[in-house]
């Protein structure tokens, strides 16, 4: 948690924030972890500390290593670690995985791509944006503040996007680039009449008296986020909460589990210490949404414990 990976390219600016955050009034000391040598705060140095920030202006491959920051309040000292790796510039266009920031997803309605780490830098608009190393041109692309907006997003817009900007420090300019992948997701959702995947209709579930038993009610309702969808259990047509048997409880399983893009819900019925009278009850798995309600009924039957001695008679 308090060790953070940071990376950059040689001859570009890199600014790293101490992963251990403190109040603005707290002092922060930076050290090279390997030597415990203090990092200077004087801005004339190529690598210097400035409060919560460690600045490489510009970075060199030899700067790679672990840096320690100690945040000091009047009564507490707390430590963080920045694991910095500086890479040589690639001669070809491909951006290797180790230089990529987190992937972002977009859709027709939301197609913002934020420039990673830009908030750490002193930069001025506009940002330059590239896709797969080609400068972006055309009215569909708009560089706005620290992000790129793509109008009328299509699946072909997926790819690696690089932002390039200039960091200014005391009148000197340093280049910074950052790349992240952009994926396009289809937001075409729909809603169906509920489909119960489990249990099967009129299923007989074998249980052992005195043991615990679980019944899972699982149903799918369509694709994408569902406005109204629920699964629940009933006992003899009565809600579990109203039935009044503390041994029998229901709890949500995986919520909105999008397997194959489908929006599904699970509800697990837990029966503790199964009793004879539980075999007489009717267990209904109910799935409902705006289209209507579907019910699958389960009954319990006694499972005779295997008499291991008799096997070898």
């Amino acid at each position: 948690k308090f060790s953070k990976q940071s990376w950059g390219l040689e001859n570009e600016a890199l600014i790293v924030r101490c992963p251990r955050q403190g109040k603005p009034s707290y002092t922060v000391d930076w050290y090279y972890s390997q030597t415990n040598k203090s990092i200077p705060t004087q801005e004339r140095n190529r690598v210097f500390a400035s409060g919560q920030l460690l600045k490489f202006l510009p970075a060199a491959v030899a700067d790679s290593g672990i840096y320690t920051c100690i945040v000091r309040s009047p009564t507490f000292n707390r430590t963080g670690y920045a694991n910095v790796t500086i890479y040589k510039k690639q001669s070809d266009c491909n951006v290797p995985d180790y230089l990529m920031y987190s992937t972002v997803s977009g859709s027709e309605k939301n197609s913002k791509i934020y420039c990673p780490t830009i908030d750490l830098y002193n930069w001025t608009a506009p940002l330059e944006w590239f896709k797969n190393c080609q400068a972006l041109q055309g009215s569909r692309y708009r560089a706005h503040k620290s992000f790129l907006v793509i109008d009328n997003v299509m699946t072909e817009d997926a790819g690696d996007y690089t932002c390039k900007f200039i960091h200014n420090e005391n009148g000197a300019n340093y280049s910074v680039t950052a790349t992240r992948s952009f994926t396009v997701k289809d937001e075409q959702g729909f809603s169906l009449f509920p489909v119960i995947g489990a249990p099967a209709q009129n299923e007989i579930k074998e249980v052992e008296i005195g043991k615990n038993a679980n019944l899972t009610c699982s149903a799918c309702f369509g694709k994408g986020t569902q406005f109204l969808a629920a699964v629940l259990w009933q006992l003899n047509g009565t809600k579990i909460t109203d039935f009044g048997e503390p041994r029998i409880q229901q709890e949500e399983g995986q919520n909105q589990s999008f397997s194959n893009g489908l929006a599904c819900l699970d509800m697990v019925l837990r029966i503790a210490d199964v009793k004879e009278e539980d075999l007489l009850l009717q267990y209904d798995c109910l799935a409902l949404n705006l289209h209507g309600l579907r019910r699958h009924t389960v009954r319990l039957s006694r499972k005779n414990p295997i008499d291991h001695h008799s096997i070898y008679c």
Epitope: K1, Q21, S73, T75, F76
Partner: antibody, heavy 123, light 107 residues
Framework: EVQLLESGGGLVQPGGSLRLSCAAS????????MIWVRQAPGKGLEWVST????????YYADSVKGRFTISRDNSKNTLYLQMNSLRAEDTAVYYC????????????????WGQGTLVTVSS | EIVLTQSPATLSLSPGERATLSCRAS??????LAWYQQKPGQAPRLLIY???NRATGIPARFSGSGSGTDFTLTISSLEPEDFAVYYC?????????FGQGTKVEIK
């Protein structure tokens, strides 16, 4: 010297209400996160609620959510806990405490505690 | 919610002996763990923060260690004033939670 002084405890019937206060002194109250922690007789410590510093965001334990409200008056250096719909299981010594570090969305230790005020919920 | 389990529930030792208290978390809390001491009729007192750092004014005989899910508070040589209840607390996220406590009593 940092000091926290709770008041407002007492005997209350189930379903009743009580308002606890915690007067703070010796530090810049407004910038610190403040916390209520309770301890039932003979039992361990249970976090009740946190209110962040200037931002004022609030957090509650599930056991008190919807019934208790934490608030602060930075001009009076005072922390409050409004307790409604009290239950027997709310009987405890209530401590107010200071989180000396927290930044937005994070939590830390409690470095100063009050002496506590006893709340008894009984008919 | 992260559950902290302290062991043993009670530790019976003599002054001068070494006390080793354990705190286990139900999931990783990194080093976001503190130890407190509480004496009867008093509020808890912070001993250790960030798993291993002693709070201001805490004697060097108290030390903390561990990371992730397993943590230890060690009192190298018990003084008469150290007999009390000790609690661990995690603060990696809300809700912050405490262990149920370990009582260190005089044998």
């Amino acid at each position: 010297e940092v000091q926290l002084l709770e008041s407002g405890g007492g005997l209350v019937q189930p379903g009743g209400s009580l308002r606890l206060s915690c007067a703070a002194s010796g530090f810049t109250f407004s910038i610190y996160d403040m916390i209520w922690v309770r301890q039932a007789p003979g039992k361990g410590l249970e976090w009740v609620s946190t209110i962040k510093g200037e931002g004022g965001g609030t957090y509650y334990a599930d056991s008190v959510k919807g019934r208790f409200t934490i608030s602060r008056d930075n001009s009076k250096n005072t922390l409050y806990l409004q307790m409604n719909s009290l239950r027997a299981e709310d009987t405890a010594v209530y401590y107010c405490a200071r989180d000396p570090w927290s930044t937005e969305g994070s939590f830390f230790v409690l470095d100063y505690w009050g002496q506590g005020t006893l709340v008894t919920v009984s008919s | 919610e992260i559950v902290l389990t302290q062991s043993p529930a009670t530790l019976s030792l003599s002054p001068g002996e070494r006390a080793t208290l354990s705190c286990r978390a139900s999931q990783s809390v990194d080093d976001d763990l503190a130890w407190y001491q509480q004496k009867p009729g008093q509020a808890p007192r912070l001993l250790i923060y960030d798993a291993s750092n002693r709070a201001t004014g805490i004697p060097a005989r108290f030390s903390g260690s561990g990371s992730g899910t397993d943590f230890t508070l060690t009192i190298s040589s018990l003084e008469p004033e150290d007999f009390a209840v000790y609690y661990c607390q995690q603060y990696i996220g809300a809700p912050i939670t405490f262990g149920q406590g370990t009582k260190v009593e005089i044998k």
